[in-house]
């Protein structure tokens, strides 16, 4: 036979404490039973009766063992800048997160209470501290050999591209242009080979230069317009 | 964080008494019942009891109900395990626990002290 | 008292592996069974309550399972840190009582 043997409610020993999932009970001076999660108690104990507990009735919860009159109520439905994370349920509360982009201002217990976008570094500047759940994007500016060309709330300065001749030198918003002088393969005569335009390079969360090919037969073209370069027919 | 850091190992004569002391920090103290487990070398761990540090009220296996004292100084956050009548059976590692009264469980547990009982 | 019984007391395994440990209680426990870990000098850990709840800090390879008297703790892929003596306990009635261990081992 279990220890646990006294059906509540009890009077305990002097000096003792009430068992598992029970409470003692002020008014009845008892040892009674608590409400599961999921419930509350309808009916306190009294000497001879014990806790009567009652579902929690929709959008409302109790998430602990308890002998709460009535359950809490769950938090109001979540905004638009919110994902609901967590349903609310007879044993728990809703929880609203912020969604891709954003980042919690103001949080509560569970969740967050307030959503705020993160911040974008303009060209110029790059990521210095990523955004987390709790924390906005610190941005820097690209300090001299590195540049960043978007706005971006991910971007980091990126070296500039190493040229044997510097067709236009970069700047912290544009990357460096070359020029050929001895190409490496047989080309016509002041041609120029374009690969993918900056706008498509992957992004790369560290900065890792990007292999140079030597000596460069390429360039990069830089966003909006740029004078043609040395030898092009143009358009 | 939380934490429960026990008073260093001692070693007994049989019929002798040892008191263990345990220090809480990190949380509100008179909140959460302080456990009792004990190891024997070798051995699982034994359930001693439990005293709840608001009113100093305690629960008992009642394998030791009559040899346990538990007590507690809530000024300093800690708690006392005191074993009476000791023999050699009793040689074990004494740890002290936060416990949860609803599902059972000890979720941060003490060093550990060792208790030596030896003629 | 309610009996814990684990299935084995040691267990040998490699990292990388799918471990379970099982642990049997002598009566219906509902889904009060907790499980721990325990390594040499270091402090006891909870790891898993109420049959399945992960206590915060966990890592989500461990997981529980079962109900009423046969209960299982899943490691999802060992890790060198596994490696430990795991204890099951039951928190439906006192006193509290836990099973025998199970030690964990390299392969």
């Known amino acids: 036979l279990p220890a646990q043997v006294a059906f509540t409610p009890y009077a305990p020993e002097p000096g003792s404490t009430c068992r598992l999932r029970e409470y003692y009970d002020q008014t009845a001076q008892m040892c009674c039973s608590k409400c599961s999660p999921g419930q509350h108690a309808k009916v306190f104990c009294t000497k001879t009766s014990d806790t009567v507990c009652d579902s929690c009735e929709d959008s409302t919860y109790t998430q602990l063992w308890n002998w709460v009159p009535e359950c809490l109520s769950c938090g109001s439905r979540c905004s638009s800048d919110q994902v609901e994370t967590q349903a609310c349920t007879r044993e728990q509360n809703r929880i609203c997160t912020c969604r891709p982009g954003w980042y919690c201002a103001l949080s509560k217990q569970e969740g967050c209470r307030l959503c705020a976008p993160l911040r974008k570094c303009r060209p110029g500047f790059g990521v210095a501290r990523p955004g987390t759940e709790t924390s906005d994007v610190v941005c820097k500016p690209c300090a001299p050999g590195t540049f960043s060309n978007t706005t971006s709330s991910t971007d980091i300065c990126r070296p500039h591209q190493i040229c044997n001749v510097v067709a236009i030198p970069g700047n912290a918003s544009m990357d460096a242009v070359c020029t050929s002088t001895s190409p490496t393969r047989s080309m016509a005569p002041g041609a120029v080979h374009l690969p993918q335009p900056v706008s498509t390079r992957s992004q790369h969360t560290q900065p890792t230069p990007e292999p140079s090919t030597a000596p460069s037969t390429s360039f990069l073209l830089p966003m909006g317009p740029s004078p043609p370069a040395e030898g092009s027919t143009g358009d | 964080q939380v934490q429960l850091v026990q008073s260093g190992a001692e070693v007994k004569k049989p019929g002798a008494s040892v008191k263990v002391s345990c220090k809480a920090s990190?949380?509100?103290?008179?909140?959460?019942?302080i456990n009792w487990v004990r190891q024997a070398t070798g051995q699982g761990l034994e359930w001693i009891g439990w005293i709840y540090p608001r009113d100093g009220n305690t629960q008992f296996n009642e394998n030791f109900q009559g040899r346990v004292t538990m007590t507690r100084n809530t000024s300093i956050s800690t708690a006392y395990m005191e074993l009476s009548s000791l023999r050699s059976e009793d040689t074990a590692v004494y740890y002290c626990a936060r416990g949860d009264r609803d599902y059972g469980y000890f979720d941060v547990w003490g060093q550990g002290t060792t208790v030596t009982v030896s003629s | 008292d309610i009996q814990m019984t684990p299935s084995t007391s040691s267990l040998s395994a490699s990292v990388g592996d799918r471990v379970t440990i099982t642990c049997r209680a002598s009566?219906?426990?509902?889904?009060?069974l907790n499980w721990y870990q325990q390594k040499p000098g270091k402090a006891v850990k909870l790891l898993i309550y109420?049959?399945?709840k992960l206590h915060s800090g966990v890592p989500s390879r461990f997981s529980g399972s079962g109900s009423g008297t046969d209960f299982t703790l899943t490691i999802s892929s060992l890790q060198p840190e596994d490696f430990a003596t795991y204890y099951c306990q039951q928190g439906n009635t006192l006193p509290l009582t836990f099973g025998g261990g199970t030690k964990l081992e390299l392969k």
């Open positions: 109420f049959k399945s």
């Open positions: 009566q219906d426990i509902s889904n009060y």
């Open positions: 990190g949380y509100t103290f008179i909140t959460y019942d």
